[in-house]
């Protein structure tokens, strides 16, 4: 069954998955997919990274870690109820039948209101955004810094962004994460 | 458009080799996953196996999996199956098939017109 | 592996008829089903992949449904073209499979 993970309307939804490069930039592809993992690859396909670099993706879908490392997890942006259900990460390691696959299970609750942090400064530069275009890239992407238009519904998310970091860590350090070589 | 050609097929004793190949041409070859499937003399179909891309990834069921292999050359548009050990189960109308992957997998939404195996003493 | 048990093996039928022909799967597969025509001495031929999405070029009177374990293909307004043989298949997991398939005959 699919291990599963939660976020609320209007904020974005953190789905862990990693693996460990056999050497620094030696990645594999990987894909993700809104629905399960079929036969091959992915279906319903939002993001995929290449050998080298992320290689198509969708609007709100991005990588917030860093995946030259390994850590594939997949952000979506400004989730609605729509996007519940189930995603498919795939590490697909060269050789016979060495694919990895992974299902995990989204659940979008209905929005709380949330008190507001003060200070944005500290939130960007801890997530500093990543802005990507619907595509097949790879299209420049930039790094922002401090965005004077951001919003509050930006700044809790990023505040959920920092406390799932930890439970990305402690997925990390618990072994949820996939050896090559 | 879109055409796969094989060939290689013919008569084979049990136990014999065979290789065969599938030519590909009318889409960039190097785009898409491509598969083997077979058909029994009974008309049912059978998935022999699969191949990524760029080659680097490859699939097989139970009943093929340590006999026989598939490979591509993205440089040559060629897809190819090497049989070894054959057996007379083997025996099938063997066909190429391409599958689109990039934004959704979908399987075999091409086929050749397949290439005759008999295995037989 | 995942048996895909296909009925009828055989089906009669007339121009201009409606036709559905089964596929029930014996693990859970999601949406993942394909299905294709087959003519005498011919390859097979995409219809519907994702269980209900037609491929280009294929005619709006063939409909697939379901998801889960059972799904169908339906023929309505059917034509002497469609008279052939058809096949599901399975790709939610490995095995790849298929039915065993069901001809489609006319009266």
């Known amino acids: 069954s699919e291990v599963e993970y939660r976020a609320e309307v209007g904020q974005n939804a953190y789905l862990p998955c990693f693996y460990t490069p056999a050497a620094p930039g030696n990645l594999v592809p990987v894909c993700w997919g809104k629905g399960a993992c079929p036969v091959f690859e992915c279906g319903n396909v939002v993001l995929r990274t290449d050998e080298r670099d992320v290689n198509y993706w969708t609007s709100r879908y991005w990588l917030n870690g860093d995946f030259r490392k390994g850590d594939v997890s997949l952000t979506i942006e400004n989730v609605t109820l729509a996007d519940s259900g189930i995603y498919c990460c795939r590490i697909q390691i060269p050789g016979i039948m060495n694919d990895e696959k992974f299902n995990l299970k989204l659940v979008i609750k209905p929005a709380k209101v949330t008190p507001a942090p003060t200070r944005q400064r500290d939130f960007t530069a801890a997530f500093p955004r990543m802005l990507t275009t619907r595509g097949h890239g790879p299209a420049e992407t930039q790094t922002l810094g401090s965005l004077p238009d951001i919003n509050l519904t930006q700044i809790s998310t990023l505040a959920n962004e920092l406390r799932d970091s930890r439970l990305a860590n402690d997925l990390r350090d618990s072994g949820a994460t996939i050896r090559i070589g | 458009q879109v055409q796969l050609q094989e060939s290689g097929g013919g008569l084979v004793k049990p136990g014999g080799s065979l290789k065969l190949s599938c030519a590909a041409s009318?889409?960039?070859?190097?785009?898409?996953?491509m598969s083997w499937v077979r058909q029994t003399p009974d008309k049912r179909l059978e998935w022999v196996a699969t191949?990524?891309?760029?080659?680097?990834?490859?699939y097989y069921p139970d009943s093929v999996k340590d006999r026989f292999t598939i490979s591509r050359d993205n440089a040559k548009n060629t897809l190819y199956l090497q049989m070894s050990s054959l057996k007379s189960e083997d025996t099938a109308m063997y066909y190429c098939?391409?599958?689109?992957?990039?934004?959704?997998?979908?399987?075999?939404?091409?086929w050749g017109q397949g290439t005759m195996v008999t295995v037989s003493s | 592996s995942i048996v895909m048990t296909q009925t009828p093996k055989f089906m009669s039928t007339s121009v201009g008829d409606r036709v559905s022909v089964t596929c029930k799967a014996s693990?859970?597969?999601?949406?993942?089903v394909a299905w294709y025509q087959q003519k005498p001495g011919q390859s097979p031929k995409p219809l519907i992949y994702?269980?209900?999405t037609r491929h280009t070029g294929v005619p709006a009177r063939f409909t697939g449904s379901g998801s889960g374990t059972d799904f169908t293909l339906t023929i309505s307004n059917v034509q002497s073209e469609d008279l052939a043989e058809y096949f599901c298949?399975?790709?939610?997991?490995?095995?790849?499979?298929f039915g065993a398939g069901t001809k489609l005959e006319l009266k």
């Open positions: 098939a391409r599958d689109p992957y990039y934004t959704n997998y979908v399987p075999m939404d091409y």
């Open positions: 009318g889409f960039t070859f190097s785009s898409y996953y």
């Open positions: 191949i990524s891309n760029s080659g680097g990834s490859t």
């Open positions: 693990q859970y597969v999601d949406t993942y």
């Open positions: 994702s269980a209900s």
């Open positions: 298949a399975q790709y939610s997991s490995s095995p790849l499979t």
